[in-house]
């Protein structure tokens, strides 16, 4: 807290500029009006200020604006943003993008912070769903935000909003979110051809269904064995060895080097060994032949 | 990757001026400041003043306050350095550097330097 | 305006030492403290920042610490290329400042 000292004279500030930097924190305090640095806002993120300066600057806003800045003052906070508590954000009402670029613009680089957090909720909530531009916008700044999001978060994520969506966007999603992302992805791009289709749902497709994977397998899309390595096991396990085989194309050679990992592993447990065979990969593991295959959900939900 | 270069040597008679410039290249010119730091022969380093390339605008050291005038080009990226009244404690290796913003006023690049001998 | 004196001002140590070196402000600077490495004829090279923060591409033998007043450059162990001058620098207030220097040169 600085101490309350009057002005020395000739020192009162007329214009927020580089003179200021060499006030003492007491003299900024006495000699910068509040009212005068709102409206010049803009010049503060242009000026050297040093983090002890910049901390009294944002005491007089604090003071002049107790409620909360308005977004006028917030769009032109600049580094001064970085000075913010998640508790002084909660009090914002953030409505424009152009708002949220210029505060997200300052943290480029670093990793979210509480701050940015806080700010891009508010903003999100503000604005009832996360809309194309804003999910651009998130996502141009932080790949990994959609993935941070809950799948309850996710469902309110409208279907056009996927296509600002970029593959390293889902890096870090789990089957979960996935499941929540693939029905959105799969109505946004429903309308293109197959290869580009593919191409497109290829990122989303660890939360696809057997029925569409199986769909898929006669399209000759040649999926990659990264990709179906991602799969959900559960959808993998009822394609059979002539369906992988389409799906995956000339990379289904793939498979004998990722014998010992899931997906492939428990799919292989329930393919019959001769079909395996077919393949000429040399895999192992697949039932003997002349064994039945009971498939006891199928029995249960047929009692 | 961000570079400042600056020029060459100069000796100067006492009382002369002397102007030193510093390129910058590698980044948005106009959204760092620049300083000017100087270093006298086996001694430390001392702050001189800062430029705003954006707008011009300066702000100098008090001891410098008088002699030292900082400009810029912006067309060419580059900032100017002008000490005038030279005496022979002004023989020194003059520095440009560039600040971090936001608080962080500290000196991530540096010029090469630039060696000024003030001499009769 | 705010003096930084560091020390020692000079010292003498061997390949693999812990190195430590020390710089005083006459007044609070909070953790406004950058650390510098000078070789002869060239300039400064940035080590580190905010106190205690290593400046990327900065090996990480070289650690920073302290607040307020006190702060200290540690080189946990001395390297053929670390023989040089060291330099604080405050950024809590203008004019900027900085400390005499640490030469260290080989025992």
């Known amino acids: 807290e600085v101490e309350k000292t009057a002005c020395p004279s000739g020192k009162k500030a007329r214009e927020i500029d580089e003179s200021l930097i060499f006030y003492k924190k007491w003299e900024l305090e006495a000699c910068v009006d509040a009212a005068l640095l709102a409206t010049q806002m803009d010049r503060v993120n242009a000026i050297p200020f040093t983090y002890e300066q910049l901390d009294v600057l944002k005491h007089k806003l604090d003071e002049l604006y107790p409620q909360g800045y308005p977004e006028s003052v917030i769009q032109h906070l600049g580094y001064l943003f970085l000075k913010m508590s998640p508790e002084d954000i909660r009090k914002w009402n953030v409505t424009s993008l152009e708002t949220l670029k210029a505060l997200l613009e300052v943290n480029k680089g670093h990793e979210m912070s509480p701050q940015v957090a806080t700010l891009i909720d508010r903003f999100v909530k503000g604005r009832g769903q996360l809309d194309k531009d804003t999910l651009d916008t998130l996502t141009a700044f932080y790949p990994g935000y959609l993935c941070s999001l809950s799948p309850e978060e996710l469902s309110s994520v409208p279907p056009s909003s996927i296509w600002a969506v970029r593959p390293q966007d889902l890096d870090t999603c789990d089957p979960r979110q996935l499941d929540v992302l693939y029905p959105k992805a799969r109505l946004a791009f429903q309308n293109m051809n197959g290869s580009e289709y593919f191409v497109k749902i290829q990122s989303f497709l660890g939360g696809a269904p057997t029925e569409d994977l199986k769909a898929l397998s006669q399209q000759n899309v040649s999926m990659d064995l990264a990709t179906f390595m991602k799969l959900r096991t559960d959808a993998v396990l009822p394609l059979t060895v002539a369906e992988v085989q389409k799906l995956l194309g000339p990379h289904v050679e793939g498979l004998k080097a990722e014998e010992r990992h899931r997906p492939v592993r428990d799919w292989i447990l329930r393919q019959r060994q001769d079909d395996l065979d077919t393949l000429g990969l040399g895999l192992q593991g697949g039932i003997p032949n002349g064994y039945l295959v009971l498939d006891l959900s199928m029995q249960e939900a047929l009692s | 990757q961000v570079q400042l270069v600056q020029s060459g040597a100069e000796v100067k008679k006492p009382g002369a001026s002397v102007k030193v410039s510093c390129k910058a290249s590698?980044?948005?010119?106009?959204?760092?400041?620049m300083h000017w730091v100087r270093q006298a022969p086996g001694q430390g380093l001392e702050w001189m003043g800062i430029?705003?390339?954006?707008?011009?605008?300066?702000s100098y050291a008090q001891k410098f306050q008088g002699r030292v005038t900082m400009t810029r080009d912006t067309s060419t990226s580059t900032v100017y350095m002008e000490l005038s009244s030279l005496r022979s404690e002004d023989t020194a290796v003059y520095y440009c550097?560039?600040?971090?913003?936001?608080?962080?006023?500290?000196?991530?690049?540096w010029g090469q330097g630039t060696l000024v001998t003030v001499s009769s | 305006d705010i003096q930084l004196t560091q020390s020692p001002s000079s010292l003498s140590a061997s390949i693999g030492d812990r190195v430590t070196i020390t710089c005083r402000a006459s007044?609070?600077?909070?953790?406004?403290l950058a650390w510098y490495q000078q070789k002869p004829g060239k300039p400064p090279n940035l080590l580190i920042y905010?106190?205690?923060s290593l400046e990327s591409g900065v090996p990480s033998r070289f650690s920073g610490s302290g607040s307020g007043r006190d702060f200290t450059l540690t080189i946990s162990s001395l390297q053929p290329e670390d023989f040089a001058t060291y330099y604080c620098?405050?950024?809590?207030?203008?004019?900027?400042?900085f400390g005499g220097g640490t030469k260290v040169d080989i025992k």
């Open positions: 550097a560039r600040a971090q913003r936001g608080g962080s006023v500290y000196f991530d690049y």
């Open positions: 590698g980044y948005t010119f106009t959204s760092y400041y």
């Open positions: 430029i705003n390339p954006s707008g011009g605008s300066t």
């Open positions: 007044q609070g600077v909070n953790s406004a």
């Open positions: 905010d106190a205690s």
């Open positions: 620098q405050q950024f809590s207030s203008y004019p900027l400042t």
